[in-house]
């Protein structure tokens, strides 16, 4: 009876996500067979989040809308470890929008999910950000510094990275 109700709950939860994500990849969390964490297929997972590299080129606003439709946001990077994981899936000759912007042009950077912007946990390339007109952040590769952030014009199409919380069933 317990197993039956748990299965029913799982199925109803899966149905919620089905319109955006027809296929989920789930792994057992810990030793308890009852706890599964899932990411949409073919998203990648790291800690408690799922990540999707969008290779379509869009402006920052359209990229964020695109992530939103999938139940996600443009990526918010909270730690060096998280960035190190993300860059494993990026191409060196491409740039990718982050969920970081300065819409007022006053150097008040803000994350899309309202995570406080912490100057101590940022990975700007040296000399960046450097232009008040460039109000959106990308992550890209520079041979001298490897991967880091740069400010660019928001309307210039780039690839992007979406991030969502893992789905627990």
């Amino acid at each position: 009876n317990f197993m039956y109700s748990k299965t029913v709950k799982r199925l109803s939860k899966l149905r919620e996500y089905q319109q955006y994500h027809p296929s989920l990849t789930c792994v057992m969390e810990g030793k308890d067979i009852e706890d599964w964490s899932c990411c949409p297929t073919p998203w990648t997972s790291f800690q408690s989040s799922c990540y999707f590299i969008s290779t379509g080129m869009q402006s920052w606003t359209k990229s964020q809308k695109n992530c939103s439709v999938m139940g996600a946001d443009l990526v918010v990077i909270n730690t060096r470890e998280e960035q190190d994981f993300i860059i494993q899936n990026l191409k060196r000759n491409s740039s990718y929008f982050l969920g970081l912007s300065d819409p007022g042009g006053r150097r008040h950077w803000q994350w899309v999910d309202q995570t406080p912007y912490n100057e101590n946990v940022t990975f700007w390339h040296s000399g960046e950000p450097n232009n008040l007109d460039e109000r959106c952040a990308i992550i890209n590769f520079r041979s001298s510094e490897e991967w880091g952030w740069n400010d660019i014009h928001c309307h210039v199409p780039q690839k992007s990275i979406c991030k969502m919380k893992k789905i627990y069933i």
Partner: antibody, heavy 121, light 111 residues
Framework: EVQLLESGGGLVQPGGSLRLSCAAS????????MSWVRQAPGKGLEWVAT????????YYPDSVKGRFTISRDNSKNTLYLQMNSLRAEDTAVYYC??????????????WGQGTTVTVSS | DIVMTQSPDSLAVSLGERATINCKAS??????????VNWYQQKPGQPPKLLIY???NLESGVPDRFSGSGSGTDFTLTISSLQAEDVAVYYC?????????FGGGTKVEIK
């Protein structure tokens, strides 16, 4: 008062090259993103190129990518547009304009009087 | 690319009467409560002049008989009381995503 003065237009044969200049005054040129916009005879407006204040980021539509190069010399307060492999359809009045950001978008708020480029054999 | 379609192509209005120009974007140009559409006026032999930005914000120095409205994909420029000096071609433009694109223009004349 903001002033933008384009020069360098003229008659050129198909396949030829031309360099347009835009002399800026009345504002701090080195802090402004700048753009070129063109208008074919009797037609509408078409964005051609944009360059950020430092000159390290440039953007073009597909119609001119690989043929046109936007650049700037902040010490001379001058914007340039190098146009190569010119075609008949590049015939237009070319305007330089200042770019002003508006949240995630932008406006082109000051425009020069334009310089005419004619591509014909 | 985002296509901006203006209507009508031309418009003849009596002095003092209202002129309305429409602009339709092929996809939404909104984000977070702002619309990334601008309107320009171009008089014969002159460069374009910015009138309205962000769909509804009047540029400094522009007479308040000009107004803009709309959101999403549908935008309107209104001249509440047409003056002789308003004879011009009017263009909408989106700045949400490169390439920036302009409408084909609407020619406003006096009837």
């Amino acid at each position: 008062e903001v002033q933008l003065l384009e020069s360098g237009g003229g008659l050129v044969q198909p396949g030829g090259s031309l360099r347009l200049s835009c002399a800026a005054s009345g504002f701090t040129f080195s802090t402004y993103t700048m753009s070129w916009v063109r208008q074919a005879p009797g037609k509408g407006l078409e964005w051609v190129a944009t360059i950020n204040s430092g000159g390290d980021n440039t953007y073009y539509p597909d119609s001119v990518k690989g043929r046109f190069t936007i650049s700037r010399d902040n010490s001379k307060n001058t914007l340039y547009l190098q146009m190569n492999s010119l075609r008949a359809e590049d015939t237009a009045v070319y305007y330089c304009a200042t770019y002003r950001p508006y949240y995630y978008g932008s406006v082109l708020d000051y425009w020069g009087q334009g310089t005419t480029v004619t591509v014909s054999s | 690319d985002i296509v901006m379609t203006q209507s009508p192509d031309s418009l003849a209005v009596s002095l003092g009467e209202r002129a309305t120009i429409n602009c339709k974007a092929s996809q939404s140009v909104d984000y977070d409560g702002n619309s990334y559409v601008n309107w320009y006026q171009q008089k014969p032999g002159q460069p374009p002049k910015l009138l309205i930005y962000g769909a509804s914000n009047l540029e400094s120095g522009v007479p308040d008989r000009f107004s803009g409205s709309g959101s999403g994909t549908d935008f309107t420029l209104t001249i509440s009381s047409l003056q002789a000096e308003d004879v011009a071609v009017y263009y909408c433009q989106q700045s949400d995503e490169d390439p920036w694109t302009f409408g084909g223009g609407t020619k406003v004349e006096i009837k």
